[in-house]
Interface confidence: medium
């Protein structure tokens, strides 16, 4: 979880909303799951499937559900206590510090590299030169050599997966 | 209730080959990545072989890369780990796990009761 | 491959302490990182995946910590059934790889 909360990930509550569990703080921190009123007198529960806190705290506000792009899958959804977790579709990635949508990982690596790093849902397969072992610039090559037999890469009739 | 139940350890020499498989139930294993991982006795957990949900992806431990083969089979909700030209250093316990619901595995979950696999002469 | 360290190697603690574990990674693993607790003779058992997210069923005792290279495991209050050995896991790359535990025994 970042600490850095921003205007955008509050979700604003009624916070006399009747179906909302109320307990009290405990040394001005309200657990998982929980929000602060603003009178700090009680704890006010997050909104399933809506909102959600991770940890202890005093936040006026629970952090807003994330939900996930076109091109991933939501692999556990939000609850109370925890924010969805979204990955990119099968064979596709999305660097972490890009805004991105998923992108197609290669299938290869260019003649004259190795693969030493597999594709994942926010990197791409990683190659480096055989003779020098720097890393490949990750521009797509002309011309690819698929590793059919590296794990990581699709499966075919000739990989050892079968 | 979600179960995962491994079988086919034992006692092998070395050089010689196993095949462990896994059965799972109570969700739809279809849907989920599977892994292997391993621990030799008194050790610490060794991940070991990943497969995604549809066996387009697959991983492999750099340790047994080359002699073992993970599949699956999603009609009889199975998962196996074909051993070849095992080592003393394969001796462990070898437990089955779940990942997550996308083809990259992530954390391992539910985990099987685990079976034991002694490689010697 | 990425290294997982974890401090320290074991821990002697009493029932109703704060318990404090730390998992390093040699390189930045943002927040792809797992707990697990083992109790011998038995399998692991996930307590909280994506640095964070706490597994259904388990107490909110448990809490992680941290992102980047550097993570805690806190159990605010240790009871009984808390005495384990503890894993941190990375599934950021692979080859995935675990630290090499923390054993919580009774003081």
């Known amino acids: 979880e970042s600490a850095l909360i921003t205007q955008q990930d509050l979700a604003p509550q009624q916070r006399a909303a009747p179906q909302q569990k109320r307990s009290s703080p405990s040394e001005g921190l309200c657990p998982p799951g929980h929000h602060i009123s603003e009178d700090g007198r009680d704890c006010i529960s997050c909104k399933y499937g809506q909102d959600y806190s991770t940890h202890w705290n005093d936040l006026l506000f629970c952090l807003r559900c994330t939900r996930c792009d076109s091109g991933e899958v939501e692999l556990s959804p939000c609850t109370t206590t925890r924010n969805t977790v979204c990955q990119c579709e099968e064979g596709t990635f999305r660097e972490e510090d890009s805004p991105e949508m998923c992108r197609k990982c290669r299938t290869g690596c260019p003649r004259g590299m190795v693969k030493v790093g597999d594709c994942t849902p926010w990197s791409d397969i990683e190659c480096v030169h055989k003779e020098s072992g720097t890393k490949h610039s990750g521009e797509v090559p002309a011309v690819e050599e698929t590793v059919t037999s590296s794990p990581g890469t699709p499966a075919s009739p000739c990989s050892l997966s079968g | 209730e979600v179960q995962l139940v491994e079988s086919g350890g034992g006692l092998v020499k070395p050089g010689g080959s196993l095949r462990l498989s896994c059965a799972a139930s109570?969700?739809?294993?279809?849907?989920?990545?599977m892994n292997w991982v391993r621990q030799a006795p008194g050790k610490g957990l060794e991940w070991v072989s990943s497969?995604?949900?549809?066996?387009?992806?697959?991983y492999y431990a750099d340790s047994v890369k080359g002699r073992f083969t993970i599949s699956r089979d999603n009609a009889k909700n199975s998962l196996y780990l074909q051993m070849n030209s095992l080592r003393a250093e394969d001796t462990a316990v070898y437990y089955c796990?779940?990942?997550?619901?996308?083809?990259?595995?992530?954390?391992?979950?539910?985990w099987g009761q685990g079976t034991l696999v002694t490689v010697s002469s | 491959d990425i290294q997982m360290t974890q401090s320290p190697s074991s821990l002697s603690a009493s029932v109703g302490d704060r318990v404090t574990i730390t998992c390093r990674a040699s390189q930045s693993i943002s927040g792809y990182l797992n707990w697990y607790q083992q109790k011998p003779g038995k399998a692991p058992k996930l307590l909280i995946y994506?640095?964070?997210s706490l597994q259904s069923g388990v107490p909110s005792r448990f809490s992680d910590s941290g992102s980047g290279t550097d993570f805690t495991l806190t159990i605010s209050s240790l009871q009984p059934e808390d005495f384990a050995t503890y894993y941190c896991?990375?599934?950021?790359?692979?080859?995935?790889?675990f630290g090499p535990g923390t054993k919580v025994d009774i003081k």
């Open positions: 109570g969700f739809t294993f279809s849907s989920y990545s």
């Open positions: 497969i995604s949900s549809s066996s387009s992806y697959i």
């Open positions: 896991q990375q599934s950021y790359r692979t080859p995935f790889t």
């Open positions: 994506a640095a964070s």
């Open positions: 796990a779940g990942g997550s619901s996308g083809w990259y595995g992530g954390w391992f979950d539910p």
